[in-house]
């Protein structure tokens, strides 16, 4: 089966990652995009730092750490309104993700 | 990076019972974690799972008998109405998430507790 | 509910063979399966997951292959420190998970 440009291979992803400094040191804010080509019941989201499939369930009632979006050694922490997470490493600094 | 399981004892049938994962070296709020439990002699038997968010899922034997809840280093199995087929090891697990090359996500259960013992006996 | 058939339930096998150890999903779990190794009176220990993928650690004489609902774990060359027992785990943390029945591996 060919693809047409711009299409994703079953089980595949890609991502857009806009990254901007924040005025506090500290703080790395983040902006990405993802998409992948999921099972059935899953939609394209952020796993362990990387692009990945997770259930549909997770992006409908925004409980985006239960993507487990951090990276191991990290905790993950949702923003206020659920607008997105943070990833707080073990020196403190904080990675903060938006979603829109 | 460790677990541990406590709280297991000689109960009598129809007695609650809660036993306790305490989590070492790692934060709960990134990691899905797992009871699973062994009968003497048997093999392992899948009980429920909790997400980073607090929310629950049950093996289908398991609904309304049994409530995984947590706090931020310990994760709790409720147990009622135990009956002597309840006698086993409980073990809990720390479950991650592996991203496979094409973006697909599969579950690890890449760390465990050593088991308590819990007795149903009259 | 998801059902993970394993076979066989017991194998014996001598240090250098090759162990091939089945488990059948009832339905499509798109390579949701992991391998866990278990000694007596021990935790298990993860072997694979995702149906293929190597834990870290692991000795690379272990592996995993299948899709769909037919997976298998193989162990090649198999040496004394394999007795043990093994399980298959399949499906997906947010729907149905399962064990399978486990293989007792015996090193003659």
């Known amino acids: 089966q060919f693809l047409k440009e711009g299409q994703l291979a079953a089980g595949t992803c890609e991502i857009v990652t806009l990254d901007r400094d924040s005025s506090q040191p500290r703080i790395e804010e983040r902006s990405q995009t993802a998409r992948c080509a999921c099972r059935k019941g899953q939609i394209a989201g952020t796993t362990r730092a990387r692009p990945a499939c997770v259930d549909a369930r997770i992006i409908k009632t925004k409980q985006w750490c239960d993507m487990l979006p951090c990276l191991e050694g990290e905790g993950c922490d949702l923003l206020i309104n659920r607008s997105g997470w943070t990833c707080t490493q073990p020196g403190g600094r904080i990675k903060t993700t938006t979603v829109s | 990076q460790s677990l541990e399981e406590s709280g297991g004892r000689l109960v009598t049938p129809g007695t609650p019972l809660t036993l306790t994962c305490t989590a070492s070296?790692?934060?709960?709020?990134?990691?899905?974690m797992g009871w699973v439990r062994q009968a003497p002699g048997e093999g392992l038997e899948w009980i429920g799972i909790?997400?980073?968010?607090?929310s629950t899922y049950y093996a289908s034997w398991a609904k309304g008998r049994f409530t995984i809840s947590k706090t931020s280093t310990t994760v709790d199995l409720k147990m009622t109405s135990l009956t002597t087929e309840d006698t086993a090891t409980y073990f809990c697990?720390?479950?991650?998430?592996?991203?496979?090359?094409?973006?697909?996500?599969?579950?690890?259960?890449?760390?465990w507790g050593q088991g308590t013992l819990v007795t149903v006996s009259s | 509910e998801l059902d993970m058939t394993q076979t066989p339930p017991s194998l014996s096998a001598s240090v250098g063979e090759t162990v091939r150890i089945r488990c059948l999903a009832s339905?499509?779990?798109?390579?949701?399966i992991s391998w866990y190794q278990q000694k007596p009176g021990k935790p298990p220990t993860l072997l694979i997951y995702?149906?293929?993928n190597l834990e870290s650690g692991v000795p690379p004489r272990f592996s995993g292959s299948g899709s769909g609902t037919d997976y298998t774990l193989t162990i090649g060359g198999v040496q004394a420190e394999d007795a043990a027992t093994y399980y298959c785990?399949?499906?997906?943390?947010?729907?149905?998970?399962?064990f399978g029945a486990g293989t007792n591996v015996e090193i003659k």
């Open positions: 697990a720390r479950i991650d998430i592996g991203v496979g090359d094409y973006g697909w996500a599969y579950d690890r259960l890449d760390l």
């Open positions: 070296g790692f934060s709960l709020s990134n990691y899905y």
């Open positions: 909790i997400y980073a968010s607090g």
């Open positions: 339905e499509d779990i798109y390579s949701g």
């Open positions: 995702g149906a293929s």
């Open positions: 785990l399949g499906g997906y943390s947010y729907s149905s998970i399962t």
